[in-house]
């Protein structure tokens, strides 16, 4: 699936704002592993057009970001990529979800590789 | 400075077809919302359809849906609005109007000077 | 029909403070921001008020904006008369997932 290419034609949604996002979550990624965040909207429906936003500045999807309802994926993260983020409400900008994302230098656990 | 140049306007039969395109200048185009607004001849502003950078999403009003499609060429700098089934009533000054930077407020900072279809027989 | 709801007529001498209202729903402008547009005549809409009641840089002090549940308002204060022109609420609709425009007031300066 190509999320960075993909438009979403939105049809009529059901749901109004909904309560206040928890809590920011942290998460810890390896260098070159897929930063991959997802946040689906309050009450379940869809609330208008969504943006991602890095450090205050708005994610523009490319090669690399790419985004899909709800899901962000930076992919072959590096450390540049640590900071905070959050999926935000386009028309008003309230927060939906926030992130505060780590990439370190090392592979994540996960990746095989050669122990010593 | 930011500048929109719609164009692409005419006079059209009922049940032809008609591209739009506004040539934008002066900003990073695609890193910003775009939306198409028309007016009927002596009537009020009516949003045709908007183009969402943040989240790739496409939205329509309900008079245009089905018929009409938004895109954009982020090389060209241009938005683009082709518009099909074109009926009497879709007579319009049609604006290309720039959303403001997508981590504030959503609100239409910039327009174009608009393009004039008429759907007539 | 507009889904915002304006009087089609105001007017006021110069010097007077006028203000126009727009009235929506819960879908709109009880939970989403409302911004104000100023049409001059022959010409392109200009921005005036965003966010209920932020100014853009350029434009007079003499604009304000405000809101109140599911109506908003528009106010000139030191009415002068390059300011007779068609002004327009907008604000984005959850139930119809676009925009919305009020059907306009034209403002006569007397």
């Known amino acids: 699936e190509s999320l960075g290419t993909e438009q979403r034609v939105v049809g009529r949604a059901a749901e109004v704002p909904g309560p206040e996002p928890g809590q920011q979550e942290q998460l810890v990624f390896g260098s070159g592993d897929a930063v991959e965040l997802s946040c689906p909207p309050p009450g379940g429906g869809p609330m208008g057009p969504t943006v991602w936003v890095k450090d205050g500045t708005g994610l523009v999807p490319s090669e690399r970001v790419l985004v899909g309802p709800q899901r962000l994926q930076v992919l072959n993260a590096s450390h540049e990529d640590s900071g905070a983020y959050s999926c935000r409400q386009r028309l008003t900008q309230r927060v939906l979800c926030h992130f505060s994302v780590r990439v370190t230098d090392a592979p994540s656990s996960g990746d095989d590789e050669d122990g010593e | 400075e930011v500048q929109l140049l719609e164009s692409g306007g005419g006079l059209v039969q009922p049940g032809g077809s008609l591209r739009l395109s506004c040539a934008a200048s002066?900003?990073?185009?695609?890193?910003?919302?775009m939306s198409w607004v028309r007016q009927a001849p002596g009537k009020g502003l009516e949003w045709v359809s908007g183009?969402?950078?943040?989240?790739?999403?496409?939205y329509y009003a309900d008079s245009v849906k089905g018929r009409f499609t938004i895109s954009r060429d982020n090389s060209k700098n241009t938005l683009y609005l082709q518009m099909n089934s074109l009926r009497a009533e879709d007579t319009a000054v049609y604006y290309c109007a720039k959303d403001a930077p997508m981590n504030e407020m959503s609100r239409f900072d910039y327009w174009g000077q608009g393009t004039l279809v008429t759907v007539s027989s | 029909q507009s889904v915002l709801t304006q009087p089609p007529s105001a007017s006021g001498t110069p010097g007077q403070r006028v203000t126009i209202s727009c009235s929506g729903s819960?879908?709109?402008?009880?939970?989403?921001?409302v911004s104000w547009y100023q049409q001059l005549p022959g010409t392109a809409p200009k921005l005036l008020i965003y966010?209920?009641?932020k100014r853009p840089s350029g434009v007079p002090d003499r604009f304000s904006g405000s809101k109140s549940g599911t109506s908003a308002s528009l106010a000139i204060s030191g009415l002068r008369s390059e300011d007779e022109a068609d002004y327009y609420c907008?604000?984005?609709?959850?139930?119809?997932?676009?925009?919305?425009f009020g059907g306009g007031t034209k403002l006569t300066v007397l």
């Open positions: 819960s879908s709109n402008i009880g939970n989403n921001y």
């Open positions: 183009i969402y950078s943040g989240d790739g999403s496409i």
């Open positions: 002066g900003f990073t185009f695609s890193s910003y919302d």
């Open positions: 907008a604000s984005w609709d959850y139930s119809l997932s676009g925009y919305v």
């Open positions: 966010a209920d009641s």
